[in-house]
């Protein structure tokens, strides 16, 4: 009698144990469910908010041309400023011509005065030559008015209507560059 | 999320392409960049691409690296050419979307005779 006993309290808690585990496995089931939902919301928004916004550029940034243009708020190195701009999806400001130089020192003189920003040029330390980010030359007219003494990185920024030199660890604002979405219309 | 793959020993004046593919996980990548980090130094960043498809290299890299991606923009690819000894570090994929930062685990490039 002890035995069968023994036996059904034994038996008892194996099917315990059973409903424990399909417990918990339903649990993290459910919690796996819930995580994919909000990566699967998350993407539908993301997806709804480009659909909605149609503009060739976004919010805050300006257009001109091909081209949309962010002009930073914050001071940070040049280092720092290339990441921040990676993460808006753009690059550092490479200007291709004097129109395109024009257009940022005009709109520069309305939106702040006569600040400092980084743009996408650097001087290479062993040739000494100044490339843009994407690895090409900048036109004659467009190389930096005066060659920083620095004996550290150097790198490329826009004042009032110059292209200067300074040392890369230097603080200043900084223009992120991307295309502009062409309208499907 | 983000797995490298593609290192290797190489001789000097070598080859290698680095491959980073994203899995579904990761979200609004704006764009996406390889770092490296050499024993006792920073890790720096040594070239990325923009969901655009624009490039940026470090002043180091210059002319023997290039960065490309696949047409889904899941993988993204670093072919380095007429590679130096100074190129010698642990490569990471990174995803740059506007909140989080995503890294890979990283993968070895040595440059040895």
């Known amino acids: 009698k002890l035995l069968q006993v023994s036996t059904i309290a034994m038996q008892q808690q194996e099917k315990l144990i059973q409903q424990e585990r399909a417990l918990l496995n339903f649990t993290e089931w459910k919690r796996s469910c819930a995580l994919q939902m909000k990566y699967c919301q998350a993407f539908m928004q993301n997806s709804l908010s480009s659909a909605h916004n149609s503009s060739p550029c976004p919010n805050n940034w300006i257009q001109n041309r091909e081209s949309c243009y962010y002009v930073s708020e914050i001071w940070s190195i040049w280092h720092t400023s290339q990441e921040n701009c990676l993460k808006e999806g753009s690059t550092l400001l490479q200007i291709e011509s004097k129109e395109e130089m024009d257009f940022i020192t005009g709109s520069l003189r309305k939106i702040k005065g006569s600040y400092d920003y980084w743009v996408g040029l650097s001087q290479d330390g062993h040739s000494g030559r100044w490339l843009w980010q994407d690895g090409s030359s900048p036109s004659p007219g467009l190389l930096p008015a005066e060659r920083s003494q620095s004996a550290n990185q150097v790198c490329g920024y826009v004042k009032s209507n110059s292209l200067l030199s300074s040392n890369c660890s230097t603080w200043k604002y900084f223009i992120c560059e991307k295309y502009a979405l062409r309208s499907s219309v | 999320q983000l797995q490298e793959s593609g290192g290797g020993l190489v001789q000097p004046g070598g080859s290698l392409r680095l491959s980073c593919a994203a899995s579904g996980r990761i979200f609004s990548v704006n764009a996406m960049g390889w770092y490296r980090q050499a024993p006792g130094k920073q890790r720096e960043l040594v070239a990325a691409i923009t969901n655009q498809g624009a490039p940026t290299y470090a002043d180091s890299v210059k002319g023997r690296f290039t960065i490309s991606r696949d047409n889904a923009g899941n993988t993204v690819y670093l072919q380095m050419n007429s590679l130096r000894p100074e190129d010698t570090a642990v490569y990471y994929c990174?995803?740059?979307?506007?909140?989080?930062?995503?890294w890979g685990q990283g993968t070895q490039v040595t440059v040895s005779s």
């Open positions: 990174k995803a740059f979307t506007r909140g989080d930062d995503y």
